[in-house]
Interface confidence: medium
């Protein structure tokens, strides 16, 4: 009998669900009335009563039933009179529920729907605090963010008030998270008051006012460490090369470094003029892996950049004259490693390059003469062949286009410093001038096992960029000609936990207080990935990877030289976020320059612009392996 009842429950639930499927609970035809006390939207944890009153023709309900999310409630139901019943919930903690009630009418075969209602519980907004406004150099926007406080669970809107202290004109911007305000629209001089009002059905709060001066809130274009070299002087010293595209004259920077085994950072401060590449000297222990990061601010101003991405350098055991290592940015080395080659011309290496070129020319002439002799004298030919093979570097007589045979690849595969054991096929584009090897780690999706409670806490640390964003983060990929182009990626704003010991300060702006669980955030998105058909990688760093790919493609006219810088410039805010866990709509934003590269690689590609559907990319991506060949 129980089984029969359960089946009927299911039939009724399905029947009602199907009858609602076109309009939802709000569009059902009611034969009565359902209401909630104290209200349809109420404070989480309250005791609530749901009343159901039947008004069905020719029906004196034998019984009134309540359903929550399609499941019949069996307890705490009180019949008030012939037509009305009450369902009581103690300490209601569900953010959303769909309630409906039915009546058992005499002579009716099945329950009759009376009415339904969606109910919501949550919290009034906290006072927004830590209101912060910054202007990223080249962006053309003032980005304002705040700590929203604890998760409200209900629709909460924020009104950002911007009031000119000079003209007293006030502008208001409605948003559900952070706000980007075009600097062009800030016509009321340089000084403003900014404050944020938070409002939802349960209450309204207003932040303290933040006074800003537009000149004081500019964050310089990101500083990037490009390479490191260790020089054998009386005391071996390591030189770190770093640069920024900033046009700001007076810039103060900090470089922090530590052995990877250490907890504590050493910090060096610099007053910098970026008219040339910066060189910073460090006296480090031999045979130790160090990690470096740099950040800058306009001298005397309030806001710092985020720390640059991690740059690793291992000091040699016995120091040669110069050991140079370039671009060892690590994105938490937990998965696929792809070595890409950048053909940057480093000033310090140019003389070496010229020497090598001259040597090769002389060598080629010699080989030509010897081969001519060889044509006419077979015995001489075989004799000299052995001697030449002993003399010339091995890479010269290898099948150069076949990079699988290349010692460069073998070296990379053997060198544990650069490559993970589980790295997939190396994709190396051959170019005669290999000056820098950049390592990209594409992290696996890690489960967020440190998930916070629903009422997630306020982080202690300042995060000046992606805190800015509630569930959305704008990733700026700057083009020096046109300013920043915001590319929106939704991802979990859960803390920026790069490491368990909290030693890496993510200087992107603080994430909101109560980050949503990855499981219940409808806006959490997985980022499509293009890393040479590696389809299981769900990390934001894939966004970086698109840029890194442009380094591989950056062999001809198809790629602007800015791309490389711009991608490297802004990696940190991507690095410092947890991997999301759901799927993004099949559209990914790529720099137009990159898309044009793809077009050159394969003529069959449709002509498309920055909005680039993922499925097209995937279908054409295998063809990019042409690069290998």
């Amino acid at each position: 009998m129980n089984q029969v009842t359960i089946q009927w429950d299911a039939v009724i639930a399905l029947y009602i669900l199907f009858s609602w499927c076109h309009g939802g609970i709000t569009n059902i035809n009611c034969s009565g009335h359902i209401w909630v006390e104290p209200a349809t939207i109420f404070k989480m944890g309250m005791n609530i009563s749901i009343y159901c009153q039947a008004a069905i023709k020719n029906c004196q309900p034998r019984k009134l039933h309540f359903y929550k999310n399609g499941i019949k409630e069996r307890f705490q139901i009180t019949r008030i009179n012939k037509t009305t019943a009450r369902l009581w919930y103690k300490n209601f903690l569900e953010p959303h529920a769909s309630m409906y009630c039915t009546a058992e009418c005499p002579k009716h075969f099945q329950e009759t729907l009376i009415c339904g209602k969606d109910i919501s519980s949550g919290y009034p907004p906290d006072i927004p605090d830590e209101v912060t406004c910054v202007i990223y150099e080249y962006s053309g926007n003032m980005t304002c963010t705040w700590n929203a406080g604890k998760l409200t669970y209900i629709d909460t809107k924020y009104v950002v008030h911007v009031k000119s202290l000079e003209t007293e004109e006030e502008q208001q911007y409605l948003t559900s998270s952070y706000i980007n305000i075009s600097t062009d629209s800030l016509q009321g001089g340089k000084k403003y008051l900014v404050w944020v009002q938070a409002a939802n059905a349960l209450g309204m709060e207003e932040s303290k006012q933040l006074q800003i001066h537009l000149d004081d809130i500019v964050i310089p274009s990101a500083a990037v460490i490009s390479r490191a070299e260790t020089i054998n002087a009386t005391v071996p010293k390591t030189i770190i090369y770093w640069d920024s595209q900033t046009t700001i004259e007076k810039v103060s920077c900090e470089m922090r470094y530590k052995a990877t085994t250490n907890q504590t950072w050493n910090v060096k401060e610099f007053d910098t003029n970026f008219t040339y590449v910066q060189q910073s000297e460090f006296y480090l222990e031999p045979n130790i892996k160090y990690v470096f990061q740099v950040r800058c601010q306009e001298t005397g101003k309030r806001y710092w950049q985020p720390w640059s991405s991690l740059f690793f350098h291992k000091t040699p055991e016995t120091v040669p004259q110069v050991t140079s290592k370039a671009f060892q940015h690590d994105t938490w080395n937990s998965g696929l490693t792809v070595a890409s080659i950048s053909t940057g011309h480093l000033t310090s290496d140019n003389r070496g390059d010229i020497g090598l070129l001259l040597g090769m020319i002389v060598f080629a002439v010699m080989l030509s003469i010897l081969s001519l002799i060889g044509i006419f004298n077979r015995s001489f030919r075989t004799g000299i062949k052995r001697r030449i093979l002993l003399l010339i570097p091995k890479w010269l007589y290898e099948d150069i286009p076949n990079m699988k045979n290349s010692n460069v690849v073998k070296m990379l595969q053997e060198n544990s410093e650069l490559m993970n054991n589980n790295s997939s096929e190396q994709v190396l584009y051959v170019d005669p001038m290999i000056t820098e090897i950049k390592e990209i780690f594409i992290p696996e999706h890690k489960p967020t096992d440190y998930k916070k409670e629903n009422t997630g806490p306020l982080e202690t640390r300042d995060y000046p960029q992606n805190s800015l964003f509630d569930n959305t983060t704008v990733v700026y990929i700057p083009d020096l000609n046109t300013g920043y182009k915001p590319q929106i990626s939704n991802f979990l704003p859960e803390g920026s936990h790069l490491s368990n010991n909290n030693e890496i300060t993510s200087l992107t702006l603080k994430p909101p207080v109560d980050s949503l669980d990855s499981g219940n955030n409808p806006r959490l998105q997985k980022h499509p990935n293009f890393a040479f058909s590696v389809s299981s990688v769900n990390s934001l760093s894939n966004t970086i990877f698109l840029g890194e790919l442009s380094l591989i493609l950056n062999q001809g006219e198809c790629s602007s030289p800015d791309i490389q810088n711009s991608v490297e410039e802004e990696t940190t805010m991507l690095l410092e976020n947890d991997s999301p866990s759901e799927t993004i709509p099949e559209q990914t934003l790529l720099p137009d320059e990159f898309v044009s590269c793809l077009g050159i690689v394969n003529e069959e590609l449709p002509s498309i612009n920055t909005y680039f559907p993922q499925n097209i990319l995937e279908s054409h991506f295998n063809r990019i392996s042409l690069l290998e060949k």
Epitope: E130, R302, E453, P457, T460, D462
Partner: antibody, heavy 120, light 107 residues
Framework: EVQLQQSGGGLVKPGGSLKLSCAAS????????MAWVRQTPRKGPEWIAF????????YYSDTVTGRFTISRENAKNTLYLEMSSLRSEDTAMYYC?????????????WGLGTTVTVSS | DIVMTQTTSSLSASLGDRVTISCRAS??????LNWYQQKPDGTVKLLIY???RLHSGVPSRFSGSGSGTDYSLTISNLEQEDIATYFC?????????FGAGTKLELK
């Protein structure tokens, strides 16, 4: 081991000024928000000021707003509290405190305190 | 401001006793309740944060519970070194506020 070494307390006349210092060691100073908490005899502690790890955010209790300034020098691992227009009711033991990973989670580590006496 | 009330200003107990100290907030503080121990020499230590989480290095005889506005700290097996004053503090809303303290003494 986390250590917060305080200094700068003393006797000062009403209306006078004083600057307290708190030298931090045993942790990455620039990773944590810091606060000043004071306590008068036979009373509970009173939070008076907070500064986020990079000094982006500064908060004060109403009792000291406009008179006290919290600041930090991350390069020197030092927290400061500059007190001006001192009143007799500011007489207390002043503690510097380091927050945990989350501000809501309270003051994870405390200094030993420094006494400030405001009296004519 | 949220007012934190510790109704018991002093409490006498014997070694080995189970001791409970209570704290009430003037409004819901969403479990952001922290407990501190202040020794007679003035040293202050965080014991419990977020209602029930033990701070590192704190003995497991300390525990916390509560929700909404009512919270408590329990010492399951009182030891000599636990003789101190205990303060609660809310971390939910600025300004952060403390209770007046409960002084624990030996019988």
């Amino acid at each position: 081991e986390v250590q917060l070494q305080q200094s700068g307390g003393g006797l000062v006349k009403p209306g006078g000024s004083l600057k307290l210092s708190c030298a931090a060691s045993g942790f990455t100073f620039s990773d944590y928000g810091m606060a000043w908490v004071r306590q008068t005899p036979r009373k509970g502690p009173e939070w008076i000021a907070f500064i986020s790890n990079l000094a982006y955010s500064v908060y004060y209790s109403d009792t000291v707003t406009g008179r006290f300034t919290i600041s930090r020098e991350n390069a020197k691992n030092t927290l400061y509290l500059e007190m001006s227009s001192l009143r007799s009711e500011d007489t207390a033991m002043y503690y510097c405190a380091r927050h945990g990973d989350y501000r809501n989670y309270g003051f994870a580590y405390w200094g030993l305190g420094t006494t400030v006496t405001v009296s004519s | 401001d949220i007012v934190m009330t510790q109704t018991t200003s002093s409490l006498s107990a014997s070694l080995g006793d189970r001791v409970t100290i209570s704290c009430r907030a003037s409004q819901d503080i969403s479990n952001y309740l922290n407990w501190y121990q202040q020794k007679p020499d003035g040293t202050v230590k965080l014991l419990i944060y977020y209602t029930s989480r033990l701070h590192s290095g704190v003995p497991s005889r300390f525990s916390g519970s509560g929700s909404g506005t009512d919270y408590s700290l329990t010492i399951s097996n009182l030891e000599q070194e636990d003789i101190a004053t205990y303060f609660c503090q809310q971390g939910n809303t600025l300004p952060w506020t403390f209770g007046a303290g409960t002084k624990l003494e030996l019988k």
